[in-house]
């Protein structure tokens, strides 16, 4: 059985300020069991953008229907993009546990923000 892969197909995405950014992520298996999280940046200072398991993320919505039992698409949309949102976003699969542990990360998608069209 092949090991789960986290696929972020877009190396970079460019969005105009004020628009929404769609960041794509799919996994190739539902196993191992555990949540998906999105982060901006890497390392200990990375910023949590979305946690499938818990939390309130008012600017973030899932693109596909995450309540489908067979769902493997964890793409997100971030609304009202500003220059402060620029950075590299990582889709990360966690393995369930106490606490959950990081299992595999996508390669990252770099978000750049264009000036708002006048």
């Amino acid at each position: 059985e092949e090991e789960l892969q986290v696929i972020q197909p877009d190396k970079s995405v460019s969005v105009a300020a004020g628009e929404s950014a769609i960041l794509h992520c799919t996994v190739t298996s539902l196993i191992p069991v555990g949540p998906i999280q999105w982060f901006r940046g890497a390392g200990p200072a990375r910023e949590l953008i979305y946690n499938q398991k818990e939390g309130h993320f008012p600017r973030v919505t899932t693109v596909s229907e995450s309540t489908k039992r067979e769902n493997m698409d964890f793409s997100i949309s971030i609304s009202n993009i500003t220059p402060a949102d620029a950075g590299t976003y990582y889709c990360v699969k966690f393995r369930k546990g106490s606490p959950d542990t990081e299992f595999k990360s996508g390669a990252g998608t770099e978000l750049s923000v264009r000036a708002k069209p006048s």
Partner: antibody
Framework: DVQLVESGGAVVRPGETLRLSCTAS????????MSWVRQAPGKGLEWVSG????????YYADSVKGRSTISRDNSKNTLYLRMSSLTAEDTAVYYC???????????WGLGTLVTLSS | ALTQPASVSANPGETVKITCSGG?????YGWYQQKSPGSAPVTLI????KRPSDIPSRFSGSASGSTATLTITGVQAEDEAVYYC???????????FGAGTTLTVL
């Protein structure tokens, strides 16, 4: 407060059809997957059927597959279960339950009783 | 199917552990309390160890491998009930329940 109120339970004859309803309040119904769980007299809990938040995807236990249909009307905050070809084994209290992110249950209704009688 | 003991008993103030096995490592577990047959179940734990905000802190959950455990620390008379473990399996898309454990407080 989350509230789930089932209705539609009745005394019915074997072979008949019945539709149960569950009206939800206190949360954004259209954002949550839902399930039906039943409990026969003197027995334990048995999952019957589940449905994704939009209603596009449905799931059934083998015991009801092919003769039950789960559906929902998000504009009415209502979940349904239509059961046909009823038999004595379908006698139970039927609960609707809200699903968590990983398809367990966090809130339950009070239940509605379906009794088969010839 | 999930396997749990048919009954357990304890004196008030004691700690009770109820185990549930058989779900495999592709499952999450929850625990549901039913105080009388036909009454609405109450979720004590979901996602192995998540306790809803309105549930007393004496209830806790854990999971290791294919076994989940519900722990009641300082059991009270009002905890007399049937406790069901439930699981969701990501390989079958199906929910299952154990047969229930009757807790008697002596």
């Amino acid at each position: 407060d989350v509230q789930l109120v089932e209705s539609g339970g009745a005394v019915v004859r074997p072979g008949e059809t019945l539709r149960l309803s569950c009206t939800a309040s206190g949360f954004t119904f259209s954002s949550y997957a839902m399930s039906w769980v039943r409990q026969a007299p003197g027995k334990g809990l048995e999952w019957v059927s589940g449905i994704s938040a939009s209603g596009s995807d449905t799931y059934y236990a083998d015991s009801v597959k092919g003769r039950s249909t789960i559906s929902r009307d998000n504009s009415k905050n209502t979940l349904y279960l239509r059961m046909s070809s009823l038999t004595a084994e379908d006698t139970a209290v039927y609960y609707c339950a809200r699903e968590t992110w990983n398809h367990l249950f966090d809130y339950w209704g009070l239940g509605t009783l379906v009794t088969l009688s010839s | 199917a999930l396997t749990q003991p048919a009954s357990v008993s304890a004196n008030p103030g004691e700690t009770v552990k109820i185990t549930c096995s058989g779900g495999g490592t592709s499952s999450y577990y929850g625990w549901y309390q039913q105080k009388s047959p036909g009454s609405a179940p109450v979720t004590l734990i979901h996602s192995d160890d998540k306790r809803p905000s309105d549930i007393p802190s004496r209830f806790s959950g854990s999971a290791s491998g294919s076994t989940a455990t519900l722990t009641i620390t300082g059991v009270q008379a009002e905890d007399e009930a049937v406790y069901y473990c439930g699981g969701y399996d990501y390989t079958t898309y199906v929910n299952t329940f154990g047969a229930g454990t009757t807790l008697t407080v002596l």
